[in-house]
Interface confidence: medium
């Protein structure tokens, strides 16, 4: 999957570990796709290092990445989206390491947005809704979402719920009364495309009602 420079070439460079990882985002800007790569070792000296992608492209053989601080980035319409591309780290014309990657298997969706929680007093529940830009996309339409919520005081005690829709109901009796909760959501491809979790949406905070002593229910 990866090949290093031959002995005698770039002796200094050979001492470094040029392992890298990438993710793609399809139709991230209208019909434009993006591909982002970064070295796994944050201490790699990236001076003079370039990334190049070849194969499974439309109209061109290869494309060069732009460098943005420590990440390497392409935005283009030219991904064929069938077949594997060869992504290489290069110094000049010499490849230091390469990976064959199908861009449809490293898709990172855009983060969900407009997360909100509405309390329904009559139903004694909370309706969680959020939005995703992927509903309008041609390619990565089907996602699985991970809704995570916690009581604000329980720093690492997150409860996770997986769902394919953008609406979730939380029963009031499952939550602590008179408590502040934090909730957030992320997405991952769930049909044909494969890849990684999106970034988390911005968190939403909501308070549960107090218990009504006469009925034993929350206010």
């Amino acid at each position: 999957e990866s090949g290093y420079a031959q002995n005698g070439d770039l002796e200094d460079a050979e001492l470094d570990d040029y392992s890298f990882s990438c993710y793609s985002q399809l139709e991230v800007n209208g019909s434009q796709h993006s591909l982002t790569c970064a070295f796994e070792d944050p201490d790699v000296n990236t001076t003079n290092l370039e990334f190049e992608i070849c194969g499974a492209l439309v109209e061109v053989k290869c494309l060069n990445f732009r460098k943005l601080q420590e990440i390497y980035f392409i935005e283009t319409k030219k991904f064929l989206l069938i077949g594997k591309s060869n992504i290489c780290v290069k110094v000049g014309e010499k490849s230091l390491t390469c990976k064959k990657i199908d861009l449809t298997t490293i898709v990172k969706p855009e983060a969900p947005f407009d997360l909100s929680v509405i309390y329904r007093e009559g139903a004694n529940d909370f309706v969680v809704t959020f939005n995703t830009s992927h509903l309008q996309k041609k390619y990565v339409k089907v996602l699985m979402h991970d809704v995570a919520y916690r009581q604000e005081k329980d720093e690492n005690k997150w409860t996770h719920v997986n769902l394919s829709s953008t609406k979730l109901t939380l029963l009031q009796r499952k939550l602590q009364p008179a408590a502040m909760y934090e909730i957030k959501v992320r997405s991952i491809p769930d049909h044909y495309f494969k890849g990684f979790w999106s970034e988390w949406s911005p968190s939403y905070y909501f308070r549960t009602p107090e218990i009504n002593n006469s009925s034993g229910e929350m206010d």
Epitope: G55, L57, V58, E59, K61, I82, G83, K84, D102
Partner: antibody
Framework: EVQLVESGGGLVQPGRSLRLSCAAS????????MHWVRQAPGKGLEWVSG????????GYADSVKGRFTIFRDNAKNSLYLQMNSLRAEDTALYYC??????????????WGQGTTVTVSS | AIQLTQSPSSLSASVGDRVTITCAAS??????LAWYQQKPGKAPKLLIY???SLESGVPSRFSGSGSGTDFTLTISSLQPEDFATYYC???????????FGQGTRLEIK
């Protein structure tokens, strides 16, 4: 040496089934989409079906859709075409072809020598 | 589906002649076109990809040009081994689909 060898052709009655195989060697099979292309006697080339390297992208010509199934076994470096409900018009020389998308587009850069399918009663 | 129409369907020419075969797509396909040569009893052979890129090992007398809907295969100086049938081919990636032209038969005059 890059090589594709088709097998499984023969004489079959209309309505019956046949399975073609293509054994690949000399290249990394699971890096490439693969295709079946046929040529009826004295006629031109007709694309039949194609399958992406991981079997997630599959396409068929309208003339065979619903009757033919393409599949592959990357562990065995093999491509297959299951042909059901065969018709007289399916009579042809069937080629297996390797796809070289690194050329920028689907292009069929290596072909087998073909296997003959004759559908007749 | 996109149709490819080759012209002429057949032509006669002599060794040393310059020959041009055209392929017209029913809608724009950028440069997503390849050319193949097929000799009787043999499998097709890739000549040109990306409309104008010469496949490795193919003689430089073969060249391709065009973009969008109109494409051309040119043989600058016919050799005896060039008498064959030539096909253009295009592809679509979603859904996976390949189309061939109907072929042009090049015969010795």
């Amino acid at each position: 040496e890059v090589q594709l060898v088709e097998s499984g052709g023969g004489l079959v009655q209309p309505g019956r089934s046949l399975r073609l195989s293509c054994a690949a060697s000399g290249f990394t099979f699971d890096d490439h989409a693969m295709h079946w292309v046929r040529q009826a006697p004295g006629k031109g080339l007709e694309w039949v079906s194609g399958i992406s390297w991981n079997s997630r992208g599959i396409g068929y010509a309208d003339s065979v859709k619903g009757r033919f199934t393409i599949f592959r076994d990357n562990a065995k470096n093999s491509l297959y075409l299951q042909m059901n409900s065969l018709r007289a018009e399916d009579t042809a020389l069937y080629y297996c072809a390797k796809d070289e998308y690194s050329r920028g587009y689907y292009v069929l850069d290596v072909w087998g020598q073909g296997t003959t399918v004759t559908v007749s009663s | 589906a996109i149709q490819l129409t080759q012209s002429p369907s057949s032509l006669s020419a002599s060794v040393g002649d310059r020959v041009t075969i055209t392929c017209a797509a029913s809608q724009g396909i950028s440069s997503a076109l390849a050319w193949y040569q097929q000799k009787p009893g043999k499998a097709p052979k890739l000549l040109i990809y990306d409309a104008s890129s010469l496949e490795s090992g193919v003689p430089s007398r073969f060249s391709g040009s065009g973009s969008g809907t109109d494409f051309t295969l040119t043989i600058s100086s016919l050799q005896p081994e060039d008498f064959a049938t030539y096909y253009c081919q295009q592809f679509n990636s979603y859904p996976l689909w390949i189309t061939f032209g109907q072929g042009t038969r090049l015969e010795i005059k």
